[in-house]
Interface confidence: low
Amino acid sequence: PEPPTACREKQYLINSQCCSLCQPGQKLVSDCTEFTETECLPCGESEFLDTWNRETHCHQHKYCDPNLGLRVQQKGTSETDTICTCEEGWHCTSEACESCVLHRSCSPGFGVKQIATGVSDTICEPCPVGFFSNVSSAFEKCHPWTSCETKDLVVQQAGTNKTDVVCGPQDRLRA
């Protein structure tokens, strides 16, 4: 019979013959022959392979470097890589999360619209009319201006997006 030119799923072609791939979590030790099956071995302690493969070496688990602000989110197994995330107050610079940067603070005049997470930065929004923020903060929202009327006071100085209104006593009418 003609030697196969294409192999079934989870097989590979070598020396004109189809050999079984190694399953996830195992590496190739020797190809199959006419008389023997593919020989595979489990990956070591800090190694993994996440696909059916013919790799002769397993990949090293990712190292979550604390010097880069990283910590382990999920420990790797023989079939999965370690997943890193950032320490509190930091977020990943990329989807692969290879390093972290400090969460952005919203400047005065801006408030937090969405709190930062391990993978996304703070989202700021300008304080609308009637609201202000006088601090640079990674989690404070815009605060509403003080209502002078409810305190039986009048506005002495208008508020801005960065400052609250200043209230003062009402002028008494002189007789």
Partner: antibody, heavy 117, light 107 residues
Framework: QVHLQQSGAELVRPGTSVKVSCKAS????????IEWVKQRPGQGLEWIGV????????NYNEKFNDKATLTADKSSSTAYMQLSSLTSDDSAVYFC??????????WGQGTLVTVSA | DIVMTQSQKFMSTSVGDRVSVTCKAS??????VTWYQQKPGQSPKALIY???YRYSGVPDRFTGSGSGTDFTLTISNVQSEDLADYFC?????????FGAGTKLELK
């Protein structure tokens, strides 16, 4: 070992205030946010707000803007929540919890506040 | 505010069963969801964070799944100690919000 120790139960009169404390140990107090959560008897959990003990910055659930004031004392690694103008609706168990990236993995044991004449 | 809806207030189960507690967010929260277990007279205990990651020490019969707006906590091979209230919480944006809770009870 992270531990949050809350102050004991309080029986208070309507219209008064109460201050609940949450003493943290086993970690760097200023490195994690502390949140406060309300639970009325037999009810669900209600988020009050959060404080950054390092900066004193806060974020409140608008519902509690005029009810709760969150503060923190770095020197004693203690977070506080003051509840003012108390009514029977404020009778509840109040929890403090440490936020780890947004999720509360460590909780205090809870403080029961009972408002009664 | 983001509303987290746990449509089933009570769920009946038997020891050894598999049960799924669901939670629906009123808007996309990515995977920023935590599941908590609470037993009477105790503080809530975090089981799952980022929708699907188990906290250390949590038995592997607890599994979280979902993203966007639909989330599920599955307990396979329910044990008597799993009878408790289960709450979901989103931490995608302020104010953080909880579901109303689902009480798991024996049939």
């Amino acid at each position: 070992q992270v531990h949050l120790q809350q102050s004991g139960a309080e029986l208070v009169r309507p219209g008064t205030s109460v201050k609940v404390s949450c003493k943290a140990s086993g970690y760097a107090f200023t490195n994690y946010l502390i949140e406060w959560v309300k639970q009325r008897p037999g009810q669900g959990l209600e988020w009050i707000g959060v404080i950054n003990p390092g900066s004193g910055g806060t974020n409140y659930n608008e519902k509690f803007n005029d009810k709760a004031t969150l503060t923190a004392d770095k020197s004693s690694s203690t977070a506080y929540m003051q509840l003012s103008s108390l009514t029977s609706d404020d009778s509840a168990v109040y929890f403090c919890a440490r936020l780890d990236g947004g999720a509360a993995a460590s909780w205090g044991q809870g403080t029961l506040v009972t408002v009664s004449a | 505010d983001i509303v987290m809806t746990q449509s089933q207030k009570f769920m009946s189960t038997s020891v050894g069963d598999r049960v799924s507690v669901t939670c629906k967010a009123s808007q996309n929260v990515g995977t920023y969801v935590t599941w908590y277990q609470q037993k009477p007279g105790q503080s809530p205990k975090a089981l799952i964070y980022s929708a699907s990651y188990r906290y250390s020490g949590v038995p592997d019969r607890f599994t979280g799944s979902g993203s966007g707006t639909d989330f599920t906590l599955t307990i396979s091979n329910v044990q008597s100690e799993d009878l408790a209230d289960y709450f979901c919480q989103q931490y995608n944006s302020y104010p953080l919000t909880f579901g109303a809770g689902t009480k798991l009870e024996l049939k």
